[in-house]
């Protein structure tokens, strides 16, 4: 089942080196993590990969008051092409679906290394 | 948190055929390798099936090749496989799980008992 790694759909994608420290932030937050990440607040999920970075901004972008991802939500407003702001809904994401944010950042965190080891990042 | 509820098993005859389910919920399943294993009567678990995040890569033990049939809609969170020709031997718990390399990513489901028999 090794040989199953994701393949990353085109779209905006950020040099190696800025996914690279992204990932870094992604494993920082869930190996750090104590108390629940964010008082354990909610996201949309996503359903796609296409537009990812956007996604997964807007998901994000929706917790405030939040310092342990405020990092990753500007890391990932460097990736997305257009503004995004708190109450947009994307069509990626998966309506009426919504999982805590420390289960979405260890999501997020396997997306990219995916993304990461098959070389999407140019 | 994190839930994989399996479906669609049953009894059948053999040369019969089944759609299993696996509903997802808890986590972003369309960023997620999954899969099926099968834990038959005695016997020790075995991986059937697995498939890539958006569909486009698939194993099949050779067990069950040309026969069984994996598939994914991300947009409905659920994971299928179809199963034909059914014999005997598939009779097994089936389980749906992710199919990451990192156990740190590992979910299960609890399971659907498929029954071939006549």
């Known amino acids: 089942l090794t040989c199953l790694g994701g393949f990353a759909s085109p779209g905006p994608v950020p040099p190696s080196t800025a996914l690279r420290e992204l990932i870094e932030e992604l494993v920082n937050i869930t190996q750090n993590q104590k108390a629940p990440l964010c008082n354990g607040s909610m996201v949309w999920s996503i359903n796609l990969t296409a537009g990812m970075y956007c996604a997964a901004l807007e998901s994000l972008i929706n917790v405030s008051g939040c310092s342990a991802i405020e990092k990753t939500q500007r890391m990932l407003s460097g990736f997305c092409p257009h503004k995004v702001s708190a109450g947009q809904f994307s069509s990626l994401h998966v309506r009426d679906t919504k999982i805590e944010v420390a289960q979405f950042v260890k999501d997020l965190l396997l997306h990219l290394k995916k993304l990461f080891r098959e070389g999407q990042f140019n | 948190g994190v839930q994989l509820l399996e479906s669609g098993g049953g009894l059948v005859q053999p040369g019969g055929s089944l759609r299993l389910s696996c509903a997802a919920s808890?986590?972003?399943?369309?960023?997620?390798?999954m899969g099926w294993a099968r834990q038959a009567p005695g016997k020790g678990l075995e991986w059937v099936s697995a498939?890539?995040?958006?569909?486009?890569?698939?194993y099949y033990a050779d067990s069950v090749k040309g026969r069984f049939t994996i598939s994914r809609d991300n947009s409905k969170n659920t994971l299928y496989l179809q199963m034909n020709s059914l014999r005997a031997e598939d009779t097994a718990v089936y389980y749906c799980?992710?199919?990451?390399?990192?156990?740190?990513?590992?979910?299960w489901g609890q399971g659907t008992l498929v029954t071939v028999s006549s």
């Open positions: 808890g986590f972003t399943f369309a960023w997620y390798d």
């Open positions: 799980a992710t199919a990451e390399r990192d156990d740190t990513f590992d979910y």
């Open positions: 498939i890539d995040d958006l569909g486009r890569r698939t």
